[in-house]
C-alpha cells in the first residue's frame, strides 16, 4: 500500500520545522499527546491541527517572535508558511471538521512537533512496509 | 528589489517542446515554494504547477500532467517549466509565481510573464 | 477540484463607491482564500490572503471577509485606479483554482 503524498509532505514539513529553531518555537501550546490514549488516529491529527492554527493565528504577528534583524524575521515568516501548510495537510487527513482540544498539559512548539514527526514517521513505516 | 523574470516564450508548433526559465532576485529563493500559473488570451488565471524550496514535492493541474514538468537550481536561483507535446489550448501568458511570505500557496510576488503560442 | 463561483462577473461603478464582490467555493475551504487585482498586460497583484489579512502595501479601502463556502471582497471607496479584473484564489487543497474573474469598469 502506497503512502499517502500528504503523508509524506507532511513529514517533509516536520522535518524542516525541527531543523531550525526560531524565537517562537520554545513558546507552549496545548500538549494534545500527554493523555492521547483513548483517541482516534483522525481525532489526534485533528487536534492536532487545532493546536497549530491556534499557535501561528496567535503568534503570526507577535512582535516577540518578529526578532530584531532580517534573519529573524525571514526564519518567522518561513515557520509560519510551514505551520500553516502542516495544519492544510493535517486537516486534510483528519477529515474532521473539527474537535475540542481542553487539555491543561502544555510543552515547547519545538517539543510538539517532535511528538508529531515520531507519530507520523510511524504512520509512514506502517504504511509503507 | 525582489524580482521574478521569464523567458523562453515563443510560437511553437502542436506537438513541440519549450522550456521557459524564471529568473529570482533580491529574495533567498532557495527558502520559497514556486508556482507557474498562465492566463490564455482573454481569459481567466489557470495554475499549472508547483515545485517545493527543495525540489522535493511537485504538483500539476491535470490539464498538463505527463507532459509538464517543473524543476528548479536553487544555485542558480532559477526556476524552470519543460513543456512538451503542446496543445494549441496550451497558449497563454506564463507567470512564474512565489508563494507568500506569510501564507503557503499564494502569489505574493510574479514575474512579467512571457507569451507561448501553439499553432501550425 | 474546488470551483469558485464569483459574483458578479462584472461591475460598473464610481470613484468614492462603495463595492462588494463575492466568492463561493463547492466545498468547504476554512480561510484559505486569497484575492488579486489585475490590469490589462499586468501580471496579477495580490490583495488579501487567508480570507481577510491586508497584503502589505495594499491600501486599507481593500478589505476581505469570510470562512468555509462563502466569502467577500470589499472595496470601501473606489479610486480610479481601482478599476481591473479580481481574481479570488482558492489554496486550500491542490489544484489550486481560482474564480473566473469580476470585471470592475468605471460607470
Known amino acids: 500500500h502506497k503512502c499517502d503524498i500528504t503523508l509524506q509532505e507532511i513529514i517533509k514539513t516536520l522535518n524542516s520545522l525541527t531543523e531550525q529553531k526560531t524565537l517562537c518555537t520554545e513558546l507552549t501550546v496545548t500538549d494534545i499527546f500527554a493523555a492521547s490514549k483513548n483517541t482516534t488516529e483522525k481525532e489526534t491529527f485533528c487536534r492536532a491541527a487545532t493546536v497549530l492554527r491556534q499557535f501561528y493565528s496567535h503568534h503570526e504577528k507577535d512582535t516577540r517572535c518578529l526578532g530584531a534583524t532580517a534573519q529573524q524575521f525571514h526564519r518567522h515568516k518561513q515557520l509560519i508558511r510551514f505551520l500553516k501548510r502542516l495544519d492544510r495537510n493535517l486537516w486534510g487527513l483528519a477529515g474532521l471538521n473539527s474537535c475540542p482540544v481542553k487539555e491543561a498539559n502544555q510543552s515547547t512548539l519545538e517539543n510538539f512537533l517532535e511528538r508529531l514527526k515520531t507519530i507520523m514517521r510511524e504512520k509512514y513505516s506502517k504504511c509503507s512496509s | 528589489q525582489v524580482q521574478l523574470v521569464e523567458s523562453g516564450g515563443g510560437v511553437v508548433q502542436p506537438g513541440r517542446s519549450l522550456r521557459l526559465s524564471c529568473a529570482a532576485s533580491?529574495?533567498?529563493?532557495?527558502?520559497?515554494?514556486m508556482h507557474w500559473v498562465r492566463q490564455a488570451p482573454g481569459k481567466g488565471l489557470e495554475w499549472v504547477t508547483f515545485i517545493w524550496d527543495d525540489g522535493s514535492f511537485k504538483y500539476y493541474a491535470e490539464s498538463v500532467k505527463g507532459r509538464f514538468t517543473i524543476s528548479r537550481d536553487n544555485s542558480k536561483n532559477t526556476l524552470y517549466l519543460q513543456m512538451n507535446s503542446l496543445r494549441a489550448e496550451d497558449t497563454a501568458v506564463y507567470y512564474c509565481a512565489r508563494e507568500g511570505s506569510w501564507s503557503p500557496d499564494i502569489f505574493d510576488i510574479w514575474g512579467q510573464g512571457t507569451m507561448v503560442t501553439v499553432s501550425s | 477540484a474546488i470551483q469558485l463561483t464569483q459574483s458578479p462577473s462584472s461591475l460598473s461603478a464610481s470613484v468614492g463607491d462603495r463595492v462588494t464582490i463575492t466568492c463561493r467555493a463547492s466545498?468547504?475551504?476554512?480561510?484559505?482564500l486569497a484575492w488579486y487585482q489585475q490590469k490589462p498586460g499586468k501580471a496579477p497583484k495580490l490583495l488579501i490572503y487567508?480570507?481577510?489579512s491586508l497584503e502589505s502595501g495594499v491600501p486599507s479601502r481593500f478589505s476581505g471577509s469570510g470562512s468555509g463556502t462563502d466569502f467577500t471582497l470589499t472595496i470601501s471607496s473606489l479610486q480610479p485606479e481601482d478599476f481591473a479584473t479580481y481574481y479570488c484564489q482558492q489554496f486550500n487543497s491542490y489544484p489550486i483554482t481560482f474564480g473566473q474573474g469580476t470585471r470592475l469598469e468605471i460607470k
Open positions: 533580491g529574495f533567498t529563493f532557495s527558502s520559497y515554494a
Open positions: 487567508d480570507a481577510s
Open positions: 466545498q468547504g475551504i476554512s480561510r484559505a
